[in-house]
Interface confidence: medium
């Protein structure tokens, strides 16, 4: 993080009403922070959403945005017929420009785009477009959601009535009705060429306050193919001053965007203000927590036949998942530890975000192989007890897989946790390998801006002389499509071997729904050549471990050093036709509760990998060369590593296991703290012997890594 001192007061810019221009003859003006008297605000920290009400009373109102839209409660409004769009099919002029406001990236529309119908009180003119996104790999970034399902990006188009006001800003400042469209972007395997001018523009506004003219684009092409299915409700600006003047049109159909195109959003920088120090950070997770519906009604369009096929292919079963059944983000901080020679303890932490509280219990599933027979057991654990489970009678010859799922009321479930593999054996083929989540099943290369050389960490546990080791594998984007054709053996084996440097391709996440029907034995795993697993169907499902977990960015409810389970005013809250009800004593006012406040979240810090030697070809384990190097145990609870007595946590034994390249920013750190990776990959000639030692900078710092990148055939660098 770069810091520099500024001498002007911490004032704001970038809220939706403030973004107007003074450029090329335009009457409107983008107000600069230093000249403006508007309050400073942010998406996290001391100026985060919970504190917006301190400077803007409207942010505590009862008709706030964004909201979650429950389709089953939305009533069809006969007045909500086809939208009339005028000018949307024209190419934009070369005066259309984009600006990095520090809070969003905005497109200032220079042409005449009008919308009417949909119950809008008049003919509204489009003023600008803004975007909201998550932190990486298609993680949830949208502000609105449908049936609890959030999307990687939300595009918002803002309108005002030019018959009533001479400018958008006048409408805002006079607290008069404006219109807004919300369009979701969903991950797709291919680039969306309609977005090319936007993506190209993003690359020109990487830094705060940068501006660039946009190549011509067609605004209609940025909207869903079908405009007939939309929701309508009355709400607010989603940024201060949170004025409750917005007639929202939320399109149900998403627009496709590829991972590659998403990277352009994740590469945007902002400056954050703290007292008189500004820091340069990635602009990520720029969405407001969802608000309660209160006495409002959400309506849906009455356009004939527009909902029919949509309902089945998207809402009920969006891309192979049942999003409406997901009641929380996954349990986190999965850990497996040996208690003794024959027992293991699985522990985890409650999900960061609970959409439909309370959590009633947890289901622990574990599966193993012995003599080619696969067995699986599932049992439940009450949520009010220690989040630990003990597995006894562990066989040293078996490979165990563990995963945990939260169970809410009405048998609603969370996404599955990270899947942990554990093996206590003598050959130790998988010894200590931790496969760090790549989150990009489609093996698309990480962008240079986000490509931190992260190690695949390891942990060798020894109890009474018996070496234990585990492999943790992330569950991919989850909840994933069950349409993946990869066999379980190939998924497990290729992922493991790829993580050990055997693989011929990019490492895939372990898809959460490809739960083994048969697991590879240690022997078979060592013999099978690795294949890259490209679970492309997986890539399409947005919510998941990162998907809906929307990390608590502002330590909601935390003030004066205290933790509080509630968020600002009604921030972070939702309710649907059950205003007066509370889901549980503990989370009275919060339909979306954030369980991980101001703490390291989701992903553990990686630590260096264990010393498995490989043949030069990279496809075979060399037997008989297992040295008992000690590696630092992975601490799943965050960025610290406790090396134990006599161990320097920063001095570990190097190996030739390549680090897993990952685009995932570790959610354990502040998502706004960017990784500042060394952009230059290790040259292929840089090889180190197993006895080499190196320093690993604490992963919490995330600006460098001591891991050695050993080339693997076909691996993307």
């Amino acid at each position: 993080v770069l810091h520099y001192v500024v001498c002007f007061p911490a004032l704001t810019e970038g809220y939706v009403g403030a973004l107007h221009e003074n450029r090329h003859g335009s009457a409107v003006q983008i107000r600069r922070r230093k000249a403006s008297g508007d309050p400073y605000w942010a998406y996290s920290g001391a100026y985060g959403p919970e504190h917006w009400v301190t400077s803007s009373v409207s942010c505590g109102g009862r008709h706030q945005s964004p909201i979650d839209i429950l389709d089953q409660y939305a009533r069809v409004g006969e007045e909500y017929q086809e939208l009339q769009l005028d000018g949307f099919d024209n190419e934009s002029s070369n005066k259309t420009w984009m600006k990095n406001t520090g809070k969003t990236v905005a497109i200032l529309l220079k042409d005449d785009y009008f919308v009417s119908g949909a119950g809008l009180p008049g003919r509204f003119k489009a003023e600008k477009v803004e975007f909201h996104w998550g932190h990486s790999n298609g993680s949830a970034g949208s502000e609105h959601s449908i049936n609890g399902r959030r999307f990687p990006v939300e595009m918002q188009i803002f309108f005002y009535n030019p018959d009533d006001f001479d400018s958008f800003q006048t409408a805002i400042s006079e607290n008069r009705i404006i219109g807004a469209m919300a369009i979701f972007f969903q991950v797709s395997p291919r680039d969306n060429s309609a977005l090319d001018p936007i993506i190209h523009g993003l690359k020109g506004v990487v830094h705060h306050e940068k501006e660039t003219f946009l190549d011509p684009f067609v605004l209609r092409d940025l909207l869903p193919a079908s405009l007939g299915s939309y929701y309508r409700y009355t709400g607010s600006l989603t940024t201060p001053p949170c004025s409750e003047i917005v007639e929202w049109i939320v399109f149900r159909r998403p627009v496709p965007i590829s991972y590659h195109q998403l990277e352009a959003f994740y590469s945007i920088f902002t400056t954050e203000q703290q007292d008189h120090v500004k820091s340069v950070e990635y602009l990520r997770n720029n969405f407001r927590p969802q608000q309660r519906l209160h006495d409002r009604v959400v309506s849906k369009s009455a356009v004939r036949d527009s909902w029919n096929h949509d309902m089945t292919d998207f809402l009920e079963n969006p891309l192979g998942t049942e999003a409406s059944k997901v009641c929380s983000s996954p349990p986190i901080h999965m850990k497996v530890q040996p208690l003794n020679q024959t027992a293991l303890q699985v522990s985890w932490s409650q999900p960061e975000t609970i959409y439909h509280p309370p959590i009633m219990n947890y289901m622990i599933s574990y599966s193993w192989t012995k003599n080619e027979d696969e067995k699986e057991k599932t049992f439940t654990k009450d949520s009010d007890k220690d989040l630990k489970a003990t597995i006894s009678h562990v066989s040293p010859d078996s490979l165990y897989l563990f995963r945990v799922q939260a169970v809410c009321r009405n048998d609603m479930r969370s996404d599955f946790s990270q899947t942990m593999l554990f093996q206590a054996n003598t050959t130790r083929i998988f010894q200590g390998t931790r496969i760090v989540k790549t989150g990009v099943p489609t093996a698309s290369p990480a962008s240079s801006a986000d490509m931190a050389p992260i190690s695949s960490g390891s942990s060798t546990w020894t109890s009474s002389g018996i070496p234990f080791s585990f492999v943790s594998m992330a569950t991919g984007m989850g909840p994933s499509s069950s349409g993946s054709q990869a066999t379980v053996a190939s998924v497990v084996t290729s992922t493991l071997l790829a993580g050990l440097g055997f693989g011929g391709g990019g490492i895939s996440s372990f898809p959460s729904t490809v739960w083994p029907t048969r697991l590879p034995t240690a022997a078979s795993a060592s013999k099978q050549a690795a294949r890259p697993v490209l679970a492309t169907t997986e890539a399409l499902a947005s919510p998941g471990p990162d998907g809906d977990s929307s990390p608590t960015k502002d330590g909601e409810g935390t003030e004066e050093g205290e933790k509080d389970e509630k968020s600002e005013s009604e921030d972070g809250e939702r309710e649907h036709e059950e205003d007066g009800e509370k889901d549980s004593e503990k989370k009275e006012k919060s339909g979306v509760t954030h369980a991980a406040e101001e703490r390291n979240q989701t992903e553990p810090s990686p630590t260096p990998s264990s010393p498995n030697r490989t043949a030069e070809g990279g496809h075979q384990t060399i037997p008989g060369h297992e040295q008992d190097h000690t590696a630092v145990p992975t601490d799943q609870t965050g960025g610290r590593r406790d090396a134990g007595p006599g161990l320097d946590p920063d001095m570990v034994t190097s190996t030739q296991v390549p680090p897993t390249a990952t685009e995932e920013q570790y959610a354990g750190s502040d998502p706004k703290r960017p990784e500042m990776p060394s952009k230059k990959p290790m040259s292929r000639g840089d090889r180190f012997s197993e006895d080499s030692r190196f320093i690993t900078v604490n992963p919490a710092e995330k600006n460098t890594s001591g891991m050695i990148s050993r080339p693997a055939p076909g691996r993307m660098e």
Epitope: P39, S55, G557
Partner: antibody
Framework: QSLEESGGRLVTPGTPLTLTCTVS????????MSWVRQAPGKGLEWIGT?????YTYYASWAKGRFTVSKTSTTVDLKITSPTTEDTATYFC??????????WGPGTLVTISS | SFVLTQPASVQVNLGQTVSLTCTAD??????ASWYQQKPGQAPVLLIY???SRPSGVPDRFSGSSSGNTATLTISGAQAGDEADYYC?????????????FGGGTQLTVT
Amino acid sequence: QSLEESGGRLVTPGTPLTLTCTVSGFSLSSNAMSWVRQAPGKGLEWIGTIDGYGYTYYASWAKGRFTVSKTSTTVDLKITSPTTEDTATYFCAREIYLGSNFWGPGTLVTISS
Amino acid sequence: SFVLTQPASVQVNLGQTVSLTCTADTLSRRYASWYQQKPGQAPVLLIYRDTSRPSGVPDRFSGSSSGNTATLTISGAQAGDEADYYCATADGSGSSYQFVFGGGTQLTVT
């Protein structure tokens, strides 16, 4: 951080009166400020709030009778046409929505003919 | 309009625990704050967001909320706790925003 009210005095009914809250140690552009009053022997009564953006909010009974405005370091409360019922101690407070520990000591306004 | 109801007066013996209540129709959807006011002084914030205590407030003071009732609990009441106690909350939306105080409870410590 401090707040101090001033301007309280004895006036006759119908004579406009402006109270001033002078702040130091924090920025009015980043904080909502409220006026609260307390008639002798009675409870606290919220009058109105001006937020960091300059938006104003009033109690339903106070609309038209009071006006809240601000400069860079002061927040004013104008009592447009006082009546005897407006006799009270007037407090200014910083952001009372979620609870504020910053209150001025109050200024006494007496409306009497 | 939105009304917060508090008992007019409550008595507690020295060293005992006392609970002051504040009720309203839809308080379950709102945050309550509690203020202590001694004669001739400005109010002092005791509890905000139902349960949070600002620094400097003794931990004898605690807040809770259940259903449409917010409660301020004072454990080990002391003579210095004798004062008026007000609950407050915000109501409304946008330009119709309202901040509401309860009528206050006079606490007597005997």
